[in-house]
């Protein structure tokens, strides 16, 4: 038995027919199955394969190599979350998020924490102390004066 | 086995809108696409769009655009068609079906009735 | 908008009847037509799908044919269950419209 064009099988009661559109994106094999156009996955063919290395859980795609990101995500993959606005030092394991690094403090992450450390503002071999954020005091050697033992 | 589950009749005004639900069952939703079909009394069918449950892309007939938003939920495996500013002419049965290849199943229909 | 011309509207056949519908469409659609029967307060069932492939559980009575822009719907031997509306639907691009319907009543 010869089928009719796109049929297929005993009985020619498979139809296949080659189609790139919103409905999919295949051609046929020779028995009449779907055989995704190069990108693209499912049933239809009508998923695309996003970029590889695209995270599953933040990032879609609808056109193949693609990788979109969810709200609050970004980086090529969409594996990195974005930071509240305004944290200057501080990272996030979720969006918005501002986790301070080691010596900064705030919800920005803005305060020092180690005024001393970073700034050592004690001069004359003063000595320095962290009293709070951005907050520090000088002890003076004897003969010197002022709040960075200037004077 | 397959099952396609409607929400219940709705009575609305005329202005008003009407959201009808459609719950599936016994394959994988995003799979494949939610059509939607309508049926006034005594009238033939009518298709009014379909939803590829996978992105939540959708597409309408014309005479229904703007008037209508189809939306689905993945996580409960429900399609929702939702019809705005209805008029009397609204009044019939809402189905939804499934399919790429004709519709193999159908929903038991959602009677709108839009009446002052 | 692709349109779909189902004819006759309404037709009276006898039990043992061959009884043939027949839908036209503005364009080619190739083989993306689908017929339904639809019996009074219920869904729509599928018959016939790719214009000629019967859906399984379809008895062998119904038959489909026709591609491009003509196509027939054939019921070899009409039994009583088979009164009911009949509609074709192409699927080939968007809207799916339908045909019209064809009442087939008891003559």
């Known amino acids: 038995v010869t089928c009719d064009d796109y049929y297929y099988g005993f009985g020619c009661n498979k139809f296949c027919r080659p189609r790139d559109d919103f409905f999919g994106h295949y051609a046929c094999d020779q028995n009449g199955n779907k055989t995704c156009m190069e990108g693209w996955m499912g049933p239809e063919c009508n998923r695309a394969i996003c970029r590889q290395g695209c995270s599953p859980k933040h990032g879609s795609c609808k056109l193949p190599g693609d990788c979109r990101c969810q709200y609050g995500w970004q980086g090529l993959y969409c594996d990195k979350c974005i930071p509240h606005p305004g944290c200057v030092h501080g990272i996030c394991n979720e969006p918005w998020q501002c986790l301070c690094e080691t010596n900064w403090g705030g919800q920005l992450c803005d305060k020092d924490l180690n005024y001393c450390g970073t700034h050592q503002p004690c001069l004359n071999g003063g000595t320095c102390s962290n009293t709070g954020p951005d907050k520090y005091q000088c002890s003076c050697p004897e003969g010197y004066s002022g709040p960075n033992c200037e004077i | 086995q397959v099952q396609l589950v409607q929400s219940g009749a709705e009575l609305k005004k005329p202005g008003a809108s009407v959201k009808v639900s459609c719950k599936v069952s016994?394959?994988?939703?995003?799979?494949?696409?939610i059509h939607w079909v309508r049926q006034a009394p005594g009238q033939g069918l009518e298709w009014m769009g379909i939803?590829?449950?996978?992105?939540?892309?959708?597409k309408y007939a014309q005479k229904f655009q703007g008037r209508v938003t189809m939306t689905v939920d993945t996580s409960t495996s429900t399609a929702y068609m939702e019809l705005s500013s209805l008029r009397s002419e609204d009044t019939a049965v809402y189905y939804c079906?499934?399919?790429?290849?004709?519709?193999?199943?159908w929903g038991q229909g959602t009677l709108v009735t839009v009446s002052s | 908008d692709i349109q779909m011309t189902q004819s006759p509207s309404s037709l009276s056949a006898s039990v043992g009847d061959r009884v043939t519908i027949t839908c036209r469409t503005s364009?080619?659609?190739?083989?993306?037509l689908t017929w339904y029967q639809q019996k009074p307060g219920k869904a729509p069932k599928l018959l016939i799908y790719?214009?000629?492939i019967l859906d399984s559980g379809v008895p062998s009575r119904f038959s489909g044919s026709g591609s491009g822009t003509d196509f027939t719907l054939t019921i070899s031997s009409l039994q009583p269950e088979d009164f009911a509306t009949y509609y074709c639907?192409?699927?080939?691009?968007?809207?799916?419209?339908f045909g019209g319907g064809t009442k087939l009543e008891i003559k």
């Open positions: 079906a499934r399919g790429y290849d004709g519709f193999a199943y």
């Open positions: 016994g394959y994988a939703f995003t799979d494949y696409a």
């Open positions: 939803i590829n449950t996978y992105y939540g892309d959708s």
């Open positions: 364009e080619n659609i190739y083989s993306y």
């Open positions: 790719h214009a000629k």
């Open positions: 639907q192409h699927h080939y691009d968007i809207p799916w419209t």
